[in-house]
Amino acid sequence: YNNFRKSMDSIGKKQYQVQHGSCSYTFLLPEMDNCRSSSSPYVSNAVQRDAPLEYDDSVQRLQVLENIMENNTQWLMKLENYIQDNMKKEMVEIQQNAVQNQTAVMIEIGTNLLNQTAEQTRKLTDVEAQVLNQTTRLELQLLEHSLSTNKLEKQILDQTSEINKLQDKNSFLEKKVLAMEDKHIIQLQSIKEEKDQLQVLVSKQNSIIEELEKKIVTATVNNSVLQKQQHDLMETVNNLLTMMSTSNSAKDPTVAKEEQISFRDCAEVFKSGHTTNGIYTLTFPNSTEEIKAYCDMEAGGGGWTIIQRREDGSVDFQRTWKEYKVGFGNPSGEYWLGNEFVSQLTNQQRYVLKIHLKDWEGNEAYSLYEHFYLSSEELNYRIHLKGLTGTAGKISSISQPGNDFSTKDGDNDKCICKCSQMLTGGWWFDACGPSNLNGMYYPQRQNTNKFNGIKWYYWKGSGYSLKATTMMIRPADF
């Protein structure tokens, strides 16, 4: 049985031929119309397509598959009957004709037929599985389609209601716009009327101003006449007073000439009973020269003469030597009292210096020096300080020993540069040193990384420009 061949006969039936020695066994099997031809073999493990099939197409294919299944089942049954019939016939023939040693051949033929049957059964099972699989997929697709349809219907309903809402809103807004337009027209008319009234008022005021200007000119002329008269009167009064005092002293030598009261500093003003903060006139020591200063009569017991104040950047502190000498600014606001007056005053007796500082975050600090004085102009108003206490740094931000005063036109610092030019303002610069309370005034949020600002290094560091500073002096024995 070394030759086992499968071929097709003329009428399209499958023909199984077994050759064994001189004997040849042929089995003719019926061919099913709907079974797959050998030219397109069935592949049981073919990958199913992922893309969803069209619904109608899927239904048609299902029906085809069902038909094939039915046909296969019928064919199998026929095949089994056929095999049984043939087996009976062949067995009879074999028993009659075959030699004993051909039993083995028959067994093999039977085995082959059984194998064929098993193969067909397996294929059928695969087809069944695929049909089931496809059916499940179709059911799922149907479910998805119906869900999707429901979702779409809901969305359409939602959008329709949204459109209706928007249309309502639109018509409401249109009404509002129209109402606003009407209102606007009315307002425009009233504004126009007001404008006309204002123009009338302005022209009236212009004529009044012209009249007032004329009156001012007249008043100025009258004022100068009055001033002259007042001056003459004052002279006459003074002459009379002199005459009177002369005659009185001649009559009564015990009555001394009453001297005009003058104050050297705010401590003297305070002691005389003036305890209200404000501007007072002070007199230079050993002189009749006067200077206006602000007196702080409240802070730390009062009696403080303010020699410097920064608070808002309203005054330019980049000034000349002469301006720093005599003072500048407004005593009720930002100002510098004047180096000459401070020098003369602090050389008369021992003074303390208090420096009060404010940052942009609402913090306050102070430095108090228990002994402070300025040298004369010949020594460039050099600063002398001793005994530091306070909250604005443990180390003095005014370099020790003290430096000469420098301005943009008076360079007395220890830098190759002109510190007053670099950092702006007059100060007791070193090279250039840890402080400059007369630097550029920078507003909030622009006050950091400013090396030419209002600096007090040992409180706020290099580039921080302070919000407010006050330098004040008072006799040490107050």
Epitope: C415, I416, C417, K418, Q421, M422, A431, C432, G433, P434, N449, K450, F451, K455, Y457, K460, G461, S462, G463, Y464
Partner: antibody, heavy 121, light 107 residues
Framework: QVQLVQSGAEVKKPGSSVKVSCKAS????????MVWVRQAPGQCLEWMGY????????GYNQKFEGRVTITADESTSTAYMELSSLRSEDTAVYYC??????????????WGQGTLVTVSS | DIVMTQSPDSLAVSLGERATINCKAS??????VAWYQQKPGQPPKLLIY???TRDTGVPDRFSGSGSGTDFTLTISSLQAEDVAVYYC?????????FGCGTKVEIK
């Protein structure tokens, strides 16, 4: 002698951060301000910011504001510069340098050897 | 920010000859200008500060001048070791800024 020694080269991914150190020796660390300057390939020198080790005060170039942080550790005399949200344009040599003055950020008299930071994905 | 514009970008000078580098500030910087020398693979080195003051140990062939907006660095007699890139730097106004450098080579 006065010396500034910087940490080694770094390779970083875009979006990450880098922290470069600068150890000072031969002088009192708190007596001078420390600045950081960078030099990108073929670009000008760029001042990034400074720290005053005495009081921890800092100042930054607005160009780097929000991305750069300069700190100092007085105990080890070391200054640090951290740059965050790195981008390829941050590839540069980063230098620390000492200012001649504590009170002002003037000129820079002593420089570190530089740290190459490469930003690449 | 103040812009510091250096000229020329590069300069080739014979040994022993004078080399002049210019730096122009976009606004008045007084005399707050420093000059640095940078050799390949090295950090910058301070040469001049306050426009004209030589730093300690800097040879006297290096000199600086100028004020306001125009500044000059001069190497009176170029030596082989002077081959480098030179930068100007203003520190008058925040933030401090640098020029983009002038490369000095030997002709």
């Amino acid at each position: 002698q006065v010396q500034l020694v910087q940490s080694g080269a770094e390779v970083k991914k875009p979006g990450s951060s880098v922290k470069v150190s600068c150890k000072a020796s031969g002088y009192s660390f708190t007596d001078y301000n420390m600045v950081w300057v960078r030099q990108a390939p073929g670009q000008c020198l760029e001042w990034m910011g400074y720290i005053d080790p005495y009081n921890g005060g800092t100042g930054y170039n607005q160009k780097f504001e929000g991305r750069v942080t300069i700190t100092a550790d007085e105990s080890t005399s070391t200054a640090y510069m951290e740059l965050s949200s790195l981008r390829s344009e941050d590839t540069a040599v980063y230098y620390c340098a000492r200012t001649r003055d504590r009170y002002d950020v003037w000129y820079f008299d002593v420089w570190g050897q530089g740290t190459l930071v490469t930003v690449s994905s | 920010d103040i812009v510091m514009t250096q000229s020329p970008d590069s300069l080739a000078v014979s040994l022993g000859e004078r080399a002049t580098i210019n730096c122009k500030a976009s606004q008045d910087v007084y005399i707050a200008v420093a000059w640095y020398q940078q050799k390949p693979g090295q950090p910058p080195k301070l040469l001049i500060y306050w426009a004209s003051t030589r730093d300690t140990g800097v040879p006297d062939r290096f000199s600086g001048s100028g004020s306001g907006t125009d500044f000059t660095l001069t190497i009176s007699s170029l030596q082989a070791e002077d081959v480098a890139v030179y930068y100007c730097h203003q520190y008058s106004s925040y933030p401090p800024t640098f020029g983009c450098g002038t490369k000095v080579e030997i002709k």
